[in-house]
Interface confidence: low
């Protein structure tokens, strides 16, 4: 059967929306009104791995591109990158684990756990038009919380 | 092919205000944020003002805040700069710039031939 | 703001040469989470507009010649024009896109 997949976007705790910035980085920032039309809409894909009621692991595509999301080492540290993919085998059901995230549900507020790199989450800084980021801690000052607002196909 | 044509320009006495336009050709203009950029006779490169897709965000320099406007119509395709309270140094050629990643990364793609503004009573 | 600074101001070589042009910043344009430099570098040929060569440092603008060379990290960033044509006779600004945009004052390349 193909992978299951949603559209959506998603926003991060003070509201910020993902936007690409040059071909392969998304940033974050408040956006208004039509501008936020530019905002990444996710290909949210359900992929296989460690399954439990909070925990569901996903793979985040680009909507329309064949581009994903993936945690890598660069000089030893668990980095977010977006990794150009053959849209011909992609999405798949068993994903690498360097595209696989655990979609963790708190109080109504999702964390992306990346599947290659436990305890290092999806984050963004609280500044303005910073880069998206794969960062080693919660509750801090960066935010690894976010919502998620579903589109249509 | 990207085209952006600058019109406008023209001698104003200083304290005078002037409105320039850029007309955008060969893109989708609503998708792509928008700079002007200046240049003194015979001198360098200095940024104006940016202005998002949507019109929400829009930054001016320092030299120009409170003075010029920036402002867009999507559905013509046009891009403006209000300019008011001229002064000498404002004489320069104003280039229209489009920026390569739509939101506020500053790399600019493609500009146009310019307009001359020139302020001198 | 960023004070950009170019050196020299021109310079004068002959076909075929290679040449190097400087660019300073007055802070770091390395953003040490994406590991990029904000850094571009325009080409103006007399009576024309600037046209983008470089960004991020050292990516060059599609249908840009190789011979035009973009390096350097931090605060310090090179442009080399690997063997000059007549063609390259412009003037060469750096800008920095690490916040609000501003630009070196330009180097000036003549052929001999």
């Known amino acids: 059967a193909p992978v299951r997949s949603l559209h959506c976007t998603l926003r991060d705790a003070q509201l910020k929306s993902l936007v690409m910035s040059g071909p392969y980085e998304l940033k974050a920032l408040h956006l208004q009104g039509q501008d936020l039309e530019q905002q990444v809409v996710f290909s949210m894909s359900f992929v296989q791995g460690e399954e439990s009621n909070d925990k569901i692991p996903v793979a985040l595509g680009l909507k329309a591109k064949n581009l994903y999301l993936s945690c890598v080492l660069k000089d030893d540290k668990p980095t977010l990158q977006l990794e150009s993919v053959d849209p011909k085998n992609y999405p798949k059901k068993k994903m690498e684990k360097r595209f696989v995230f655990n979609k963790i549900e708190i109080n109504n507020k999702l964390e992306f756990e990346s599947a290659q790199f436990p305890n290092w989450y999806i984050s963004t800084s609280q500044a303005e038009n910073m880069p998206v980021f794969l960062g080693g801690t919660r509750g801090g000052q960066d935010i690894t919380d976010f919502t998620m607002q579903f589109v249509s196909s | 092919d990207v085209q952006l044509v600058e019109s406008g320009g023209g001698l104003v006495q200083p304290g005078g205000s002037r409105k320039l336009s850029c007309a955008a050709s060969?893109?989708?203009?609503?998708?792509?944020?928008m700079h002007w950029v200046r240049q003194a006779p015979e001198k360098g490169l200095e940024w104006v003002a940016y202005i998002s897709i949507g019109s929400y965000t829009v930054h001016y320099a320092d030299t120009v805040k409170g003075r010029f406007t920036i402002s867009r119509d999507n559905p013509k395709n046009t891009l403006f700069l209000q300019m008011t309270s001229l002064r000498s140094e404002d004489t320069a050629m104003y280039y229209c710039?489009?920026?390569?990643?739509?939101?506020?990364?500053?790399?600019?793609?493609?500009w146009g031939q310019g307009t001359s503004v020139t302020v001198s009573s | 703001d960023i004070v950009m600074s170019q050196s020299p101001s021109s310079l004068a070589v002959s076909t075929g040469e290679k040449v190097t042009m400087s660019c300073k910043s007055s802070q770091s344009l390395l953003n040490s989470r994406t590991r990029k430099n904000y850094l571009a570098w325009y080409q103006q040929k007399p009576g024309q507009s600037p046209k983008l060569l470089i960004y991020?440092?050292?990516t060059r603008e599609s249908g840009v010649p190789d011979r035009f060379t973009g390096s350097g990290s931090g605060t310090d960033f090179t442009l080399t024009i690997g063997s000059v044509q007549a063609e390259d006779l412009a003037v060469y600004y750096c800008?920095?896109?690490?916040?609000?945009?501003?630009f070196g004052g330009g180097t000036k390349l003549e052929i001999k």
């Open positions: 710039v489009r920026d390569d990643y739509d939101v506020t990364d500053y790399t600019m793609d493609y």
């Open positions: 800008k920095q896109t690490y916040n609000f945009p501003t």
């Open positions: 060969g893109f989708t203009f609503s998708s792509f944020g």
């Open positions: 991020w440092a050292s």
